[in-house]
Interface confidence: medium
């Protein structure tokens, strides 16, 4: 497993290959939007710090009936050490800020790209 330097995670950290696959899936979502992603559904914003994967899953799992993000939800569940169900929230959510799923996915993508650019996963 690859260590995220300075990135305290409460569980297993995804290996480089798995994270690459997640990034590519997020790329596919952001680049191939023909209509508003998930019909413009809103989700809670999260702090992109420790426990990010679980927090991201907790936000996205509340979006139902959106096939475009189902694979992302499955991939995130593999990165989160505990079971996440709809309606579950951690302190990592910015509970006063909701954003569109499209913006959420892009923010997550850019953060993961930044980790790679900083040499965390080369």
């Amino acid at each position: 497993l690859t260590c995220l330097g300075g990135f305290a995670s409460p569980g297993p950290v995804p290996p480089s290959t798995a994270l690459r696959e997640l990034i590519e899936e997020l790329v596919n979502i952001t680049q191939n939007q023909k209509a508003p992603l998930c019909n413009g559904s809103m989700v809670w914003s999260i702090n992109l710090t420790a426990g990010m994967y679980c927090a991201a899953l907790e936000s996205l799992i509340n979006v139902s009936g959106c096939s475009a993000i189902e694979k992302t939800q499955r991939m995130l569940s593999g990165f989160c050490p505990h079971k996440v169900s709809a309606g579950q929230f951690s302190s990592l959510h910015v509970r006063d800020t909701k954003i569109e799923v499209a913006q959420f996915v892009k923010d997550l993508l850019l953060h993961l790209k930044k980790l790679f650019r900083e040499g965390q996963f080369n």
């Epitope: 790329v27 952001t30 191939n32 850019l110 930044k114 790679f116």
Partner: antibody, heavy 122, light 108 residues
Framework: EVQLLESGGGLVQPGGSLRLSCAAS????????MSWVRQAPGKGLEWVSA????????YYADSVKGRFTISRDNSKNTLYLQMNSLRAEDTAVYYC???????????????WGQGTLVTVSS | SYVLTQPPSVSVAPGQTARITCGGN??????VHWYQQKPGQAPVLVVY???DRPSGIPERFSGSNSGNTATLTISRVEAGDEADYYC???????????FGGGTKLTVL
């Protein structure tokens, strides 16, 4: 320190051929996509072609597809652009550029060579 | 194919703020990079991933991207900022890199 050094430019007649080279140093060449970008005199930047780190995927602008071929030799840390059936409108400074990430659809170019001038004229 | 539209020129007095726009259909869904090019020189990346700055680029340079417009903002403009500026994205529908037409920044 990242360095990109283009060579191979010069004067060629319409219909002729030319091969540009770009010698790279200061980074793990095979880990990054590379690209050629050109600039006609007094005009803006125009993307020409790109190639993945492994060389397995190539991309071309419509204006050069079928005439230009991009390739790379990772053992020599060198990028190439074979230009055939050259036209007057191909006259430009050709820049070699290093992509900032492994995922093609996230490409920005963080390092550029100084360029080599290609003049197509009879 | 995807088109990025930039104003041909922007003029600003020293010390003021320059804003250079880059328009594109739903560009907010794409990742935008900005380059500075001075006469006779190669382009230099000044903002990547919509709003991040490479090391060595002054904090005066910043970027934003939402809706149909990405913006490069240069605060406290200096004479040395006079250059051409280009925005760039990847267009997944064509598998092409796309550059804007460029904006000439003139410092009055």
């Amino acid at each position: 320190e990242v360095q990109l050094l283009e060579s191979g430019g010069g004067l060629v007649q319409p219909g002729g051929s030319l091969r540009l080279s770009c010698a790279a140093s200061g980074f793990t060449f095979s880990s990054y996509a590379m690209s050629w970008v050109r600039q006609a005199p007094g005009k803006g930047l125009e993307w020409v072609s790109a190639i993945s780190g492994s060389g397995g995927s190539t991309y071309y602008a419509d204006s050069v597809k079928g005439r230009f071929t991009i390739s790379r030799d990772n053992s020599k840390n060198t990028l190439y652009l074979q230009m055939n059936s050259l036209r007057a409108e191909d006259t430009a400074v050709y820049y070699c550029a290093k992509a900032d990430f492994w995922s093609g659809t996230l490409w920005g170019f963080d390092y550029w060579g100084q360029g080599t001038l290609v003049t197509v004229s009879s | 194919s995807y088109v990025l539209t930039q104003p041909p020129s922007v003029s600003v007095a020293p010390g003021q703020t320059a804003r250079i726009t880059c328009g594109g259909n739903n560009i907010g869904n794409k990742i935008v990079h900005w380059y500075q090019q001075k006469p006779g020189q190669a382009p230099v990346l000044v903002v990547y991933d919509d709003s991040d700055r490479p090391s060595g680029i002054p904090e005066r340079f910043s970027g934003s991207n939402s809706g149909n417009t990405a913006t490069l903002t240069i605060s406290r403009v200096e004479a040395g900022d006079e250059a051409d500026y280009y925005c760039q994205v990847w267009d997944s529908s064509s598998d092409h890199v796309v550059f804007g037409g460029g904006t000439k920044l003139t410092v009055l």
